[in-house]
């Protein structure tokens, strides 16, 4: 999986979208989890409604919300009132039984200021940035 970077500004909201094949993942609940280390587990932050048919209903855990457009095939996560400690590597997951498929790896960056964006022009709108190839050097 490539990693998609989403950048937001501290104190503001950030919306993360994870597109997927709606037929392939039909009937599956989704989840948003945080990778806590190179080899550590992905710690569940929030998951969609227990009843798949109600996945469109927004579910909150603290300042993080999740909602799933199961027909369109888009999982949306909202991080409200972004703080620096919200930055990190996350995953959108599709759940089946005790297994989880990674839909997208997401790197959330929280900037102190919109102008901190490294390619900032006169105006910069928070959101999705380019994808980066995974390039992990083994030691």
């Amino acid at each position: 999986h490539n990693t998609t970077v989403f950048q937001g500004v501290a104190g503001q909201s950030l919306q993360v979208s994870c597109p997927y094949d709606s037929m392939k993942h039909w009937g599956r609940r989704k989840a948003w989890c945080r990778q806590l280390g190179e080899k550590g587990p992905c710690q569940r932050v929030v998951s969609t409604h227990n009843l798949w048919l109600l996945s469109f209903l927004r579910r909150w855990n603290g300042s993080t919300a999740i909602t799933d457009d199961t027909l369109g095939g888009t999982l949306t996560i909202t991080l409200r009132n972004l703080q620096p400690h919200d930055a990190g590597l996350y995953q959108c997951q599709s759940l089946h039984g005790s297994e989880a498929d990674t839909l997208r790896k997401v790197l959330v960056e929280v900037l102190a200021d919109p102008l901190d964006h490294r390619d900032a022009g006169d105006l910069w709108f928070p959101g999705e940035s380019e994808s980066f190839e995974d390039a992990h050097v083994e030691h």
Epitope: Q35, P84, H85, A87, H117, F132, H136
Partner: antibody
């Protein structure tokens, strides 16, 4: 794990670029912070860089004074300070953050680089 | 910016004594606080993060706690290598800020 460059003596108005070479971990996986300590004083956070993307966030106080960069190929973080004055004479530390974040603070610190600004 | 008010600024204590240092946050930091130790040679080491989690390799005589906006570092029984400068750091929001420091000296 974090090896900083040696002490420097620079003239007022000049610039200085110091380095922080990382080893023993995947450089791009961990944020790098820079911190200033003036003689006999407390610590001040200058800013942070994500080595994976190059994205930076600065303390407003150091915007325009400090520039943070990385060289992924050599696992080295850099901080450049410009238009130096006596107020910039201090020890500067690099401090590693946590996995793609600073959500557990700064676990590892460099030994510090002493910058002296004097005519 | 969040102000971290650290007290006392200096403290003289004897070997084996129990001491406590405090940092008060001017705004809510939700436990995003760590304690750092700086030795006379300038070396900085993190002792505690998330207000109360002890770093691996740090002696059990160090502990961290929280009461509202007050955060404390306690050393249960001072040893010679504990005489150093101590700082708190809040990493809840930008810009990250440090306490003014506590110089712990031998009485």
């Amino acid at each position: 794990q974090l090896q900083e460059s040696g002490p420097v003596l620079v003239k007022p108005g000049a610039s200085v670029k110091m380095s922080c070479k990382a080893s023993g971990y995947t450089f791009t996986d961990y944020y790098m912070n820079w911190v200033k300590q003036s003689h006999g004083k407390s610590l001040e956070w200058i800013g942070v860089i994500n080595p994976y993307t190059g994205a930076t966030s600065y303390n407003q106080k150091f915007k325009g004074k400090a520039t943070l960069t990385v060289d992924k190929s050599s696992s080295t973080a850099y901080m450049e300070l410009n238009s130096l004055t006596s107020e910039d004479s201090a020890v500067y530390y690099c401090a590693r953050g946590t996995y793609y974040s600073n959500y557990e603070g700064f676990p590892y610190w460099g030994q510090g680089t002493l910058v002296t600004v004097s005519a | 910016d969040i102000q971290m008010t650290q007290s006392p600024s200096s403290l003289s204590a004897s070997l084996g004594e129990r001491v406590s240092l405090t940092c008060r946050a001017s705004q809510e930091i939700s436990g995003y606080l760590s304690w750092l130790q700086q030795k006379p040679d300038g070396t900085i080491k993190r002792l505690i993060y998330a207000a109360s989690t002890l770093d691996s390799g740090v002696p059990k005589r160090f502990s961290g706690s929280r009461s509202g906006s007050d955060y404390s570092l306690t050393i249960s029984s001072l040893e010679s290598e504990d005489f150093a400068d101590y700082y708190c750091l809040q990493y809840a929001s930008y810009p990250y800020t440090f306490g003014g420091g506590t110089k712990l000296e031998i009485k």
